[in-house]
Amino acid sequence: GITIPRNPGCPNSEDKNFPRTVMVNLNIHNRNTNTNPKRSSDYYNRSTSPWNLHRNEDPERYPSVIWEAKCRHLGCINADGNVDYHMNSVPIQQEILVLRREPPHCPNSFRLEKILVSVGCTCVTPIVHHVA
Amino acid sequence: GITIPRNPGCPNSEDKNFPRTVMVNLNIHNRNTNTNPKRSSDYYNRSTSPWNLHRNEDPERYPSVIWEAKCRHLGCINADGNVDYHMNSVPIQQEILVLRREPPHCPNSFRLEKILVSVGCTCVTPIVHHVA
C-alpha cells in the first residue's frame, strides 16, 4: 500500500477515485545510462535455445510496440549445431506494466495493465521425458 | 506521438503540460488470465544457464518490488552437471516501464521511467574466447 510520508509540495487531488487515479508525466526518464541493452541483441541467434522476435503492436497501449520472443525449436542446439530433443527450449516470461487507453482512443486517460511477455528462451532439462 | 481519433467521452484536461501529464487508473487490469506464470518459476533451476533471483525494492517506485536475475555461473551446465566454460551464461535483459514518484514521496504524482532488468539467463556460444 501507499504509506509514505506525504511531501507538502505534492499536487493536490480532488478526484473522488483518489488514490486510484494518479497524475503521470509521460516524459520518460531513462535510468539505463550505464548499461547498453543492445549488447544482448544477438543472444537470440547465439543461444543454445535460439528465438525469433515478433512485433506486437497495439495503438491503444503504451508502449504501442512490444517484441515477443518465440523459441525456434522444441529442443536445444548441441555442440554439433543439431537440435537435441533430450533438452527443451522454453520461453522466459515476465509480467510487465503497460498503460491502456481508457476510455478507448483517449489521449490523456489510461489504466495500468499487467501483461505477460516472453523475453527470450533458455535451455532446460525436461521434467516430462518424451524422448527415450 | 499520440495521434488517435479522440473519443468525445474522454476526461477533459486543463493541465498546461497536457499531453505530457495524463491521468492513470492504478486499478490494475490483468490480461494474463489464460497463462500460468508459475509454470516458468522453476526454469531458473533447471536451465543450463541457471540464475538466482534478487529482490530490488524501492518505495519511490511503482511497482516497488522488482526481481532481478543474476546468472549463477560464467559458463553453462553440461550433460554431466559440470560447468562448461566454453559456453557463456548471459542475462536476458528487457527495458520495462515503471512509475517513479515525482515529486518524491507523493502518493498521487508519478513520472514514467524506463529501467533495464535481467529476467533470466541463456547459454550462448562465446564471441570472446577467454578459455582455450
Epitope: N34 | C71, R72, H73, L74, V83, V90, P126
Partner: nanobody, 123 residues
C-alpha cells in the same frame, strides 16, 4: 555510479607473490561476475581472470593459468587476485571491474574504470 578501489600492488622480484584486492562500493554490483584486467605500458588492456559472485567458479587467461587465483567475499563486496610465481611480463596496472555479461563482456562494454594498482616485477 559504481566505485572500484583496487589495492595491493607493489614492487616484487620475479618468482615472488602479491595479493590484490578490489572493493566495490555499491550495494550490489550490477553484474553477476567480476573480472581482473591489466594494462602494460604501451599495450591494450587485457583480461586476466573472472569469477562468478554466486557460483564462485573462476576462469583465467592462458598467460596466468596455474599461477594466479581469483576469489571473492560476497559479504564484503570484495574480490581478490592471489598472484604467485610472478614474471617480469606480469608488470602492468591491474584493474577490477563488474562483468555485466559475464564472459561475454568486452572492453567496449565499459565506460568506467577505477584507478588501478601498479604491479612491477623485477628480474
Amino acid at each position: 555510479q559504481v566505485q572500484l578501489v583496487e589495492s595491493g600492488g607493489g614492487l616484487v622480484q620475479a618468482g615472488g607473490s602479491l595479493n590484490l584486492s578490489c572493493v566495490i562500493s555499491r550495494r550490489t554490483p550490477s553484474g553477476y561476475a567480476m573480472g581482473w584486467f591489466r594494462q602494460a605500458s604501451g599495450k591494450e588492456r587485457e583480461f586476466v581472470a573472472a569469477i562468478s559472485w554466486i557460483g564462485g567458479g573462476a576462469v583465467y587467461a592462458d598467460s596466468v593459468k596455474g599461477r594466479f587465483t581469483m576469489s571473492r567475499d560476497n559479504a564484503k563486496n570484495t574480490v581478490y587476485l592471489q598472484m604467485n610465481s610472478l614474471k617480469p611480463e606480469d608488470t602492468a596496472v591491474y584493474y577490477c571491474n563488474d562483468m555485466p555479461y559475464g564472459l561475454d563482456t568486452t572492453m567496449d562494454d565499459y565506460d568506467y574504470w577505477g584507478q588501478g594498482t601498479l604491479v612491477t616485477v623485477s628480474s
